[in-house]
């Protein structure tokens, strides 16, 4: 039988003979020279040469364990003298061991990697990778080991799996934020020989919030003119924070001092300032200082630096409001006054007052916009505001008039205002009542007494507290009457009724009844208004058929009574 | 001329198994190592097996290992893969190829293939 | 181990060079064959040992190999060039390793 072990051969020789493989040998081989040792397979006779007497084989050729890691040939034993096989004809492996020819090959030139700042000694940060193309199965060629070249004593690096730590405690981003980390990975297990290569790992620090926000200076001061409207800025202060992003990210608030009331603080999100604004109207003759007290934090607090102290901080701020001339300001918004349409020219109606709210108090004049007055039909006392009629006035023309007073300050005619004048003009019984409309009224000749042929309606331009209250009657010189009368229905209307039975339209054509209306008001006001009726032919339904009188024979037929 | 011819594919259910013949000539069978590649269906090229010349060695990829065995008979200048346990993702045409090592231990030339479905 | 990887496509212009890559750690240390496969036919050797030429295959199928990258080329490609190439290699002991193949589209 065959006896050989599996056979090894190192790529890459370089010696100047063949490289020796093994030795093939079969049991049934005296050593006479009767035995033939054949090599088939891969690489037979090119890459393996056999002395076929010793059963020796030897590489011819330098070998690369990468072109092909194993090599399988076959083995003859055959008689010298008859060439039957002694052996069974068999294969065997002869596997190139790799020599370490490759040096580790990081997977990247340049890793980049961030660990937060304070953390904790072993942090995790990034893990490198190298890898050789050596056999692995085969010696230390493609065992790789990690060390650090630079960047101690910050970082370490584990030694079999490539992985970064931070080395060192309370690595502050504020003091130091990249750091330029080489990695040496060495092949044959680190050992002496091995081979090597480097790969750089930026790191950054990347921010923790472990800096409570300051104020440059314990005490601001602004100054601001009472007129300022609510919102409107008057100064900023700023709080310093060594942190950055969200972690230097700043809340302003008022936590105390005079001025809670009156001012406000907003943060800027851009800039990180507190804008100091006024949030209630100043007033200098009020109050001309305020004292605040400011206080700058942070929003995101990380609980295990609380022990580094409060994470923020208080600034004292004064603000000085500074006196602003102020126009006149009236005793109220707006006046309503009133006053009777019978009122004599220069009647004193009310008055308005201003007053300068200044310090200083300066006196006020009066006068009246004349684009809301026209007609000048008031005037105003300039010393003190007394307003008076300067024409006679009529409700009936117009109720309201809605007119403008200005108060100037004298000493400073630029500083003015103005306040508006609702006068009333009330209501006197200076109309007397008429008719609603023009009455024209139709009888049938044929008409019975007592019949109604007009309802009357009156008006008056007058507006009377209680409401009108007309009454009717027949004007005194047609009160006798034996054609027609009126009736007072007490509602405002009242009646025209016929006396008689049967008028005759060729005896009187048209009558005129003067017909007197009075209200009940003080002083008491009437008219006298004219019902025209005319005289018809009617059909038996009643129906008017002819009301024209040329078809009469006497030529006079109006009348104004009887 | 040199020849290699795959036969054996067919349809069979997840679990089952199947016997792949590779039937050679033209040249000397018995003095080449051989593989068997296959291609699953729009996929690229994927190694499965290898034997050597006189059948002494084999070597399988992980995705076939303890499931597949490849085996040569020279005396019938055929090459086999039993496959057992098949599961859908062995779907894919089986091609057999010789490894000439006067093409630097390349495969040439390989059979046209067999079509294996594993589905149920 | 060794891993090869390829671009999924490339194309090219009748009569310009086309060049597919095979990338791979260290891919000079190790030796690369190319196949070229066309739609429902088996692979072909094209290039054997980094940069040799089978009997057969025209003199436009060229091959290199260094650094990280192993690359087929070839030059004056015709419209018959147009196939899916695969790049392998021996990896460790007994197995062998592809790439995942290169479509080559020549255009017009």
């Known amino acids: 039988s065959w006896m050989w072990n599996q056979f090894f051969l190192l790529e890459e020789y370089t010696g100047s003979d063949y490289q020796y493989v093994g030795k093939l040998h079969s049991d049934q081989d005296r050593g006479d020279g009767s035995l033939k040792y054949i090599l088939s397979g891969d690489g037979a006779g090119d890459l393996f040469i056999i002395n076929e007497n010793t059963g020796d084989i030897q590489a011819t050729k330098r070998l690369d364990r990468e072109e092909k890691p194993v090599y399988i040939l076959r083995a003859q034993a055959v008689n010298r003298r008859t060439g039957r096989p002694v052996e069974p004809e068999s294969e065997f492996i002869i596997k190139i061991h790799d020599i370490n020819d490759n040096e580790p090959i990081f997977t990247k030139d340049v890793y980049t990697a961030t660990v937060p700042e304070m953390a904790d000694v072993g942090t995790f940060v990034v893990q490198v990778t190298a890898t050789d193309a050596d056999d692995p199965t085969y010696g230390n060629s493609a065992k790789v080991v990690y060390s650090i070249l630079q960047g101690q004593p910050y970082f370490s690096v584990e030694s079999e799996t490539g992985i970064i730590k931070t080395a060192l405690l309370n690595m502050d981003r504020e003091n130091r934020e990249q750091y330029q980390v080489v990695i040496q990975a060495k092949d044959m297990g680190g050992q002496m020989g091995g081979l090597s290569g480097t790969t750089t790992v930026n790191i950054t620090l990347t921010d923790v919030n472990d800096n409570p926000p300051r104020f440059p200076q314990s005490t601001y001061q602004f100054k601001t003119p009472e007129s300022s409207p609510p919102g409107t800025p008057i100064g900023r202060i700023k709080a310093s924070d060594a942190d950055v992003g969200e972690n230097a990210e700043i809340e302003y608030s008022i936590t105390d001092g005079e001025g809670h009331e009156m001012f406000d603080v907003i943060t800027d999100q851009e800039t990180q300032e507190g804008i100091i604004t006024v949030k209630k109207l100043l007033d200098f003759e009020k109050k001309k200082v305020y004292t605040l007290k400011v206080e700058a934090s942070n929003p995101h607090v990380e609980p295990r630096f609380l022990y580094l102290g409060p994470f923020k901080d208080s600034a004292t701020v004064r603000i000085v409001v500074d006196d602003v001339d102020e126009p006149p300001v009236f005793s109220k918004l707006a006046y309503i006054l009133q006053i009777r349409e019978d009122a004599r020219i220069n009647t004193t109606i009310g008055s308005v007052a201003a007053q300068d709210p200044d310090a200083a108090r300066n006196p006020v004049k009066y006068s009246v916009d004349r684009h809301t007055d026209m007609d000048r039909i008031f005037n105003i006392d300039s010393g003190n505001g007394s307003i008076f009629t300067s024409k006679l006035l009529d409700r009936e023309t117009l109720l309201w008039h809605n007119i403008t007073v200005i108060a100037t300050e004298i000493n400073n005619p630029k500083q003015s205002s103005r306040v508006p004048l609702y006068i009333k003009v009330l209501d006197v019984n200076d109309n007397a009542p008429e008719f609603a409309e023009f009455y024209e009224t139709f009888v049938c000749e044929k008409a019975k007494a007592d019949q109604l042929i007009q309802t009357l309606r009156a008006v008056d331009k007058d507006d009377p507290y209680s409401g009108h209250q007309f009454s009717f009657s027949l004007a005194p010189e047609a009160a006798s009457s034996s054609n027609f009368t009126i009736q007072d229905n007490k509602d405002n209307t009242a009646g025209i009724l016929t006396r008689k039975n049967g008028y005759n339209r060729h005896e009187m054509s048209t009558y005129l009844l003067p017909v007197v209306i009075s209200d009940n008001d003080y002083p008491v006001q009437s008219s006298t208004g004219t019902v025209t009726v005319r005289v018809c032919a009617c059909d038996h339904h009643g129906n008017m058929q002819s009301c024209h009188a040329e078809a009469l024979i006497h030529p006079t037929g109006l009348s104004t009574g009887a | 001329q040199v020849q290699l011819l795959e036969s054996g594919g067919g349809l069979v259910q997840p679990g089952g198994s199947l016997r792949l013949s590779c039937a050679a000539s033209g040249f000397t069978f018995s003095s080449y190592a051989m593989h068997w590649v296959r291609q699953a269906p729009g996929k690229g090229l994927e190694w499965v097996s290898f034997?050597?010349?006189?059948?002494?060695?084999?070597y399988y990829a992980d995705s076939v290992k303890g499931r597949f065995t490849i085996s040569r008979d020279n005396s019938k200048n055929t090459l086999y893969l039993q496959m057992n346990s098949l599961r859908a993702e062995d779907t894919a045409v089986y091609y057999c190829a010789r490894e000439t090592a006067g093409y630097g231990y390349a495969f040439d030339p390989w059979g046209q293939g067999t079509l294996v479905t594993v589905s149920s | 181990d060794i891993e090869l990887t390829q671009p999924p496509s490339v194309s090219v212009s009748p009569g310009q060079t086309a060049s597919i890559t095979c990338s791979g750690d260290n891919i000079r240390k190790y030796v690369v064959h190319w196949y070229q496969q066309k739609p429902g036919q088996a692979p072909v050797l094209v290039i054997y040992?980094?940069?040799n030429r089978p009997s057969g295959i025209p003199e436009r199928f060229s091959g290199s190999n260094s650094g990280n990258t192993a690359t087929l080329t070839i030059s004056g490609t015709q419209a018959e060039d147009e196939a899916d190439y695969y790049c392998?290699?021996?990896?460790?002991?007994?197995?062998?390793?592809f790439g995942g193949g290169t479509k080559l589209t020549v255009l017009g």
């Open positions: 392998q290699s021996w990896d460790s002991f007994l197995a062998v390793v």
């Open positions: 040992r980094d940069n």
């Open positions: 034997i050597s010349s006189l059948g002494s060695y084999t």
